[in-house]
Structures are given as C-alpha cells and as structure tokens.
C-alpha cells in the first residue's frame, strides 16, 4: 500500500480580521494509526493549534467529526482571526508510541495570511495655542493594519498639504503595522473656523478612507487689537472713554482701566460679538467726571487675552480744555452696564 | 452540559482493591482522552494516566504502573481507575479529567484504613 | 520526566497588591503546553490560564500569564479576596504529564 500522505492544498488563505479561517488537510491512509495535530510554525518552537485528543482549544472545530472511523478529512476552522493568527499552518500526522506519539508526516503548510482594518485615525495638534503666522504641528496616528501598504493624506478646509511626513512602523515582517504622520500647518488669521484631516486609505477599507480631525480653533490664538477713544456724553462735565477689544480668539480675556495707573475697574469679557471669521469683538467703556480733576488723566484700556502678558492702550484726556472739543469720531457703542464715574 | 460524574467514596481496607467510575455525559465520549489525576489531602495534583475512549489506547505513569488500570465502556460512556494492593498512600481524592482539562468530575474519596 | 517546581509555596497578599507566582520546568516546555488551574477548598480544580498566557472563560482580567522555556508565571494585578486559592502548574508536553506542588494564595 502506498505510503499515508498529508494534504494541505491551499497554498496560502487570505481572511479578514474577525472571520473564521478554514484551513484544509486530508491524508491519504489510515495507516498508520495516530492523531493529526496542527502546528503554527515550524521546529521545536512551534505553536501547537489543534489536538484532536487533548488540550484546550476554544476558537478551533474540526470540518467533520475526527472520531469516525474512517475519518481522513482532518480540515479546521479558526475563529475571530486576528492579525496576531498570520503565519504558516502544518498539519501533521503522528504514529502511536510510547511514551510519546512521533511525528510521522507533514503538510506541506497554508500561509494564513490576515487583512485588518487600521484604527480610526486620532489628530492631535500641539499642547500651547500659537498665533497667527506661525507654524504647528499636527499628528496622525492609525494602528492595527495588516498588509502593510497604506496611504495617507492631510487637507485643511479641503486643500491637500504637502509638508508632512510619515513612518509605517515596524519595518520588517509584523503580524500588524501601525502609521504615525506629523504635518505642519502655518496658521493664519482666519483660521478660528478651519479643520486639519487626516485621511487613511488601506485595502480593508474599499476605497471609503477614514478620516480623523482637528479644529484650529483648538490651536490658534488669535490676539486682539485694541483702540481707545472719547466723546463728551451727558453733562458737559462727563466723558465716555472707549475701549473696543478686537479680533480675538478664545474668548477668555481680561480688561482692566487704570487712571493715571491706579487700577479703576477690572471686567471680563461677557456679552461678546461674534465676526463671520469666528474671532470676537468687545467693548468697555468708562464715564469719566472731568470736574474731579485738576491735571490731566492717562486712562489705560490693559487686556489680559488667554493667559498672556497683557497689551495695553493709553488716552491722555486733557482736563484743561473742554470736553466737547476734544471728542474723537469713532461713535461708541452701548454693549453693556459697564458705567463708572471718577470721583 | 458537559458533566463527568464519578462513583461516591469509597471506605476499603489495605490490600484489597477498588474501581472508581466516571460516567460522562453532554460530549462525545471518543472525542478525547479521559486522564485520572491524584490529589492526597493537603496536597499537590498527580497524573496517574489516561485512556483514548476510541481505541482503548492507554498511558501510564510509571509510578502509578503497577497500581493504577484505567479502562472504558464505551456502550456506557464510562471511564474506570482500578487501584490495587491498596495501602494508606493511596488515600486521597480521584479526579477523573476530560481531555480538555476544562472538564473534571467532582473527585471521589478513597480512604484505605483497617 | 519534567518536574515543575512552583515558588513560592506558600504566599500571603493584601488586597489590591500585585502578585506573581513562578513555574519553573527541570526541561523546556513549548508555551502550547503550560496550563495553570485554581483550587479551592473542598472543589474540583479549574482551568485557569491555557497556553502560558490566555485566560480561560470567565477569569477576571487581572490574571495574567507568561513565559517561555523552563520559566513560566501566573500574576495577578491586584489581588482581590475571592483570590485566595491554590494555583497548580501543569505540562503535557510530554509524558508523563506532570503537575507543580502549587502555590496556596492567602488574603491578608
């Protein structure tokens, strides 16, 4: 009789992570009599997969029932694949002996090989808001891709970037791959409103990329202008001096009056208007008795923005001359009870 | 359900002998092996051997070689350990252990005293 | 025969403490081949952990094992009361199977 061979006739099985892979082997004989195992790898290191006889084996069935008695399909399944399951499947048959069964015949192997999606990917952008002009840096990272072959773009508001660049690591043979990518982005004033994307594209995806992002407005600092003006207002012994806070982003900002610096009154920025680009606009102003006074007063309009060293705006108003002469025509708006007379 | 259930225990003198039973149920019985696994009060586990339901095929610890028999009755799905010459070593708890070693009988309790 | 020898025999935790207890094996063992089972008082042992390093259904994922050779562990992250149990290495690589003399876990 011809001697027992073990047939593995797939070359090599190609599964999703998470589907079951099946992995086939016949043998052409009973004889000898023994138990066919299956191996992943090969030599003394090999990992042992399947024992029909003993030992736990929870993710893997046989295709039929082992126990028959002239059973000579020996073909599994393997459940809820991973990347970590890539690699090559023997399947071997033993002859009975004592102590230990001995290896009698092998297959010639099935190259399992898994396809997994990457992990959405996460954008992060620098741990300090910057300011306009600047330039910051962006991170994309997607993980758990198996081929290795993959591709990745960046966009902002839609626009392809061009100065970045990306690591697939490992970069030799791993059971799955994971890509990190650093872009850098030059902020300018408008971009409170902007997004940074990051785009992914791998086989397991069918040409749907995923895509992670990033709004500027989580990076940018966009500090304010300020202008400081006077116009006579009520009585002829009172002035409204204006302070209006411009074009700022966030929102977090402090204002603070000095006469003469003496601090007069400290707010913050409250009811605040909103410009199409997404920046903000704030005014404060402050009734000013000019009768009180002999000399001049110095007001300064100071503001704290977002934590950082304050920007300040000074007006000399002239106590010798009238009130009415002196006015500026920038007209003020009313943005809130923010009066307050100096005695 | 998966259940090995094994004989009650069992009070016998030295010298004499005894078989323990292991009826299994839930499973194919000649799917694996069905081993025997010694525990003495207080102390570790140790093999004592195994049997293939499928062919009757058997192996043994050496140390238990001349005091241990395992057998089946396939038409009942039932493993059996056979101990001989029993002497006060031999108390102990008896776990009869499908080949998983996921699945063991709940144990039966051999005391040998005069 | 492989003998395996567990250390230590014996070993006391306080709750919430990280535990490891060591197997280790008189001649290599393929990982395939390393299984580790709880016991406690008056039960049937369980499987605990296959294959060196994964957990049998329903164990709590705090345990965990690993190694390689003749050195294999069994750790817990942090140990809980429920814990407290004897915990036996076992080989099949090769006959005669073989069994650790365990570790008994006591809970302060």
């Known amino acids: 009789e011809e001697e027992l061979q073990v047939i593995q006739p797939d070359k090599s099985v190609l599964v999703a992570a998470g589907e079951t892979a099946t992995l086939r082997c016949t043998a052409t004989s009973l004889i000898p009599v023994g138990p066919i195992q299956w191996f992943r790898g090969a030599g003394p290191g090999r990992e042992l997969i399947y024992n029909q006889k003993e030992g736990h084996f929870p993710r893997v069935t046989t295709v039929s029932d082992l126990t028959k008695r002239n059973n000579m399909d020996f073909s599994i399944r393997i459940g809820n694949i991973t990347p970590a399951d890539a690699g090559t499947y023997y399947c071997v048959k033993f002859r009975k002996g004592s102590p230990d069964d001995v290896e009698f015949k092998s297959g010639a192997g099935t190259e399992l090989s898994v396809r997994a999606k990457p992990s959405a990917p996460v954008v992060s952008g620098p741990a300090a808001r910057a300011t306009p002009q600047h330039t910051v840096s962006f991170t994309c990272e997607s993980h758990g891709f198996s081929p290795r072959d993959i591709t990745l773009k960046w966009f902002k508001n839609g626009n392809e970037l061009s100065d970045f660049q990306t690591n697939v690591d490992p970069v030799g043979e791993s059971v799955s791959y994971s890509i990190h990518s650093t872009a850098k982005v030059v902020l300018t004033r408008e971009d409170v409103h902007s997004q940074v994307i990051c785009e992914v594209a791998h086989v397991t995806l069918q040409g749907d990329p995923l895509r992670g992002t990033a709004n500027l407005s989580e990076t940018i600092r966009v500090p304010p202008t300020l202008e400081v003006t006077q116009q006579p207002v009520r009585a002829e012994n009172q002035v409204n001096v204006t302070c209006q806070v411009r074009k700022f982003y966030p929102q977090r900002l402090q204002l603070t009056w000095l006469e003469n610096g003496n601090v007069s009154r400290t707010e913050t920025a409250s009811t605040v208007t909103e410009n199409k680009d997404g920046t903000y606009n704030w005014m404060s102003w402050l009734l000013v008795n000019v009768s009180a006074h002999r000399d001049d007063v110095k007001l300064t309009c100071q503001v704290e923005h977002d934590g950082q060293p304050a920007v300040s705006k000074s007006h000399d108003l002239k106590v010798s001359a009238h009130p009415k002469e002196q006015g500026s025509n920038t007209a003020a708006e009313n943005t809130g009870s923010n009066e307050r007379n100096i005695y | 359900e998966v259940q090995l259930q094994q004989s009650g225990a069992e009070l016998v003198k030295p010298g004499a002998s005894v078989k323990l039973s292991c009826t299994a149920s839930g499973f194919n019985f000649e799917d694996t092996y069905i081993h025997w696994v010694k525990q003495r009060p207080d102390q570790g586990l140790e093999w004592i051997g195994r049997i293939d339901p499928a062919d009757g095929d058997t192996k043994h610890n050496p140390k238990f070689h001349d005091k241990a028999t395992v057998t089946v009755d396939t038409s009942s799905n039932t493993a059996y350990l056979e101990l001989s010459s029993l002497t006060s070593e031999d108390t102990a708890v008896y776990y009869c252990?499908?080949?998983?070693?996921?699945?063991w009988g709940q144990g039966t309790t051999l005391t040998v005293s005069s | 025969q492989i003998v395996l020898i567990q250390s230590p025999a014996i070993m006391s935790a306080s709750p919430g403490e990280r535990v490891t207890l060591t197997c280790r094996a008189s001649s290599s063992v393929t990982s395939s081949y390393l299984y580790w089972y709880q016991q406690k008082p008056g039960s049937s042992p369980k499987l605990w952990i296959y294959?060196?390093?994964n957990l049998a259904s329903g164990v709590p994922a705090r345990f965990s094992g690993s190694g390689s050779g003749t050195s294999y562990s069994l750790t817990i992250s942090s140990v809980e009361a429920e814990d407290a149990a004897s915990y036996f290495c076992?080989?099949?690589?090769?006959?005669?199977?073989?069994f650790g003399g365990g570790t008994k876990l006591e809970i302060k």
């Open positions: 294959s060196a390093s």
């Open positions: 076992h080989q099949w690589y090769s006959y005669p199977r073989t």
């Open positions: 252990v499908r080949g998983n070693y996921v699945n």
